[in-house]
């Protein structure tokens, strides 16, 4: 009696179970009662990443430099090329189809997490006692200067964008 289901890594065709082609190979001809499934390796710049019965291999992805992309991992017969973004940019989607410039944290904000090839800069407001006076994709908030450790007093309060201004003790009123 012809099978209605096949084992793993097999497929049903013409009432019989044939072996699937292994990753990195494509199907040339189905098996018969007398012959095994015929498979051929994928060509250069092609791949198939699963056990399959595909008659054509997929083209390796092209990392388009004009879109800010570069190769992170070269493709093989069994895997696609992995793209990432050039320095100073990050992927805008999970598949890294395009890149965007890392955002900078504005004055009053510091970098909480530096951007990577796959994630943008994360900024956070500088709390009281800290400041950032620059727009930067790398700098954290800086602590206000401690005037007392320099035998000075605060002449002007700090803000989230400016450091305190220290002055001599003799300006006490």
């Amino acid at each position: 009696e012809p099978p209605t289901a096949c084992r793993e890594k097999q497929y049903l065709i013409n009432s019989q179970c044939c072996s699937l082609c292994q990753p990195g190979q494509k199907l040339v001809s189905d098996c018969t009662e007398f012959t095994e499934t015929e498979c051929l390796p994928c060509g250069e710049s092609e791949f198939l990443d699963t056990w399959n019965r595909e008659t054509h291999c997929h083209q390796h992805r092209h990392c388009e430099p004009n879109q800010g992309l570069r190769v992170k991992k070269e493709g093989t017969a069994e895997s696609d090329t992995v793209c990432t973004c050039k320095e100073g940019q990050h992927c805008t989607s999970k598949d890294c189809e395009a890149c965007a410039q890392h955002r900078s944290c504005s004055p009053g904000f510091g970098v909480k997490q530096i951007a990577t090839g796959v994630s943008d800069t994360i900024c956070e407001p500088c709390p009281v006692g800290f400041f950032s006076n620059v727009s930067s994709a790398f700098e954290k908030c800086h602590p206000w200067t401690s005037c007392e450790t320099k035998d000075l007093v605060v002449q002007q309060a700090g803000t989230n964008k400016t450091d305190v201004v220290c002055g001599p003790q003799d300006r006490l009123r």
Epitope: G110, K112, Q113, E124, P125, P127, V128, G129, F130, K140, C141, P143, W144, S146, E148, V153, V154, Q155, Q156, A157, G158, T159, N160, V164, G167, R171, L172, R173
Partner: antibody, heavy 122, light 113 residues
Framework: QVQLQQSGAELMKPGASVKIPCKAT????????IEWVKQRPGHGLEWIGE????????NYNEKFKGKATFTADTSSNTAYMQLSSLTSEDSAVYYC???????????????WGQGTLVTVSA | DIVMSQSPSSLAVSVGEKVTMSCKSS????????????LAWYQQKPGQSPKLLIY???TRESGVPDRFTGSGSGTDFTLTISSVKAEDLAVYYC?????????FGGGTKLEIK
């Protein structure tokens, strides 16, 4: 120990000004912010601003700019808050307070005065 | 400005009961640079000045009974009184000191049944 002493109640006419003192003892007055807080019934607590007596440096809540003015006299260890052009909205208890740390950590208010009740009435 | 919201606005409990009250901020009060939450809790008994209970969201002020516990991080905070005493009748306020202007919650009034 740290103490902040405030004056008693003040009854003021609309349009007038009032200057509320806060006398500090038990610490180096010039080195710590003096905070000012307003409390109206049903309105909770509102931060008005702060003054650093050593330099006269100030931070104001935008809402109270033009209404409150802070000064400090280091010779008498007294901070002052002047409220101008008084209206019934200014009727409240006004507290002075002092943070635990000096000036660079953000302020939670560890020490409080007993409050000054200001009543504005014609 | 950072908006602080407290709930409930009032609650009545019996002596010995556990009570929790909530404080939420409109932006995170956790600074990654020092992993501290810039939040304090105060108790104000009738006719008195506010009194500091908790700072850095969970550090108990010296002399405050250990039945008072602060917890939470980011934007959600809780003050818990493990076993309420009659003397805990008060209004409880949270305050953020992350950024100017410092702001307080509207308060939670604790009444004793």
């Amino acid at each position: 120990q740290v103490q902040l002493q405030q004056s008693g109640a003040e009854l003021m006419k609309p349009g007038a000004s009032v200057k509320i003192p806060c006398k500090a003892t038990g610490y180096t007055f010039s080195s710590y912010w003096i905070e000012w807080v307003k409390q109206r019934p049903g309105h909770g607590l509102e931060w008005i601003g702060e003054v650093l007596p050593g330099s006269g440096s100030t931070n104001y809540n935008e809402k109270f700019k033009g209404k409150a003015t802070f000064t400090a006299d280091t010779s008498s260890n007294t901070a002052y808050m002047q409220l101008s052009s008084l209206t019934s909205e200014d009727s409240a208890v006004y507290y002075c307070a002092r943070p635990y740390y000096r000036y660079d950590v953000g302020a939670w208010f560890a020490y409080w005065g007993q409050g000054t009740l200001v009543t504005v009435s014609a | 400005d950072i908006v602080m919201s407290q709930s409930p606005s009032s609650l009545a409990v019996s002596v010995g009961e556990k009570v929790t009250m909530s404080c939420k901020s409109s932006q995170s009060l956790l600074y990654s640079g020092n992993q501290k939450n810039y939040l304090a809790w105060y108790q104000q008994k009738p006719g008195q000045s506010p009194k500091l209970l908790i700072y850095w969201a969970s550090t108990r002020e010296s002399g405050v009974p250990d039945r008072f516990t602060g917890s939470g991080s980011g934007t959600d905070f809780t003050l818990t009184i493990s076993s309420v005493k009659a003397e805990d009748l008060a209004v409880y306020y949270c305050q953020q000191y992350y950024s100017y202007p410092y702001t307080f919650g509207g308060g939670t009034k604790l009444e004793i049944k």
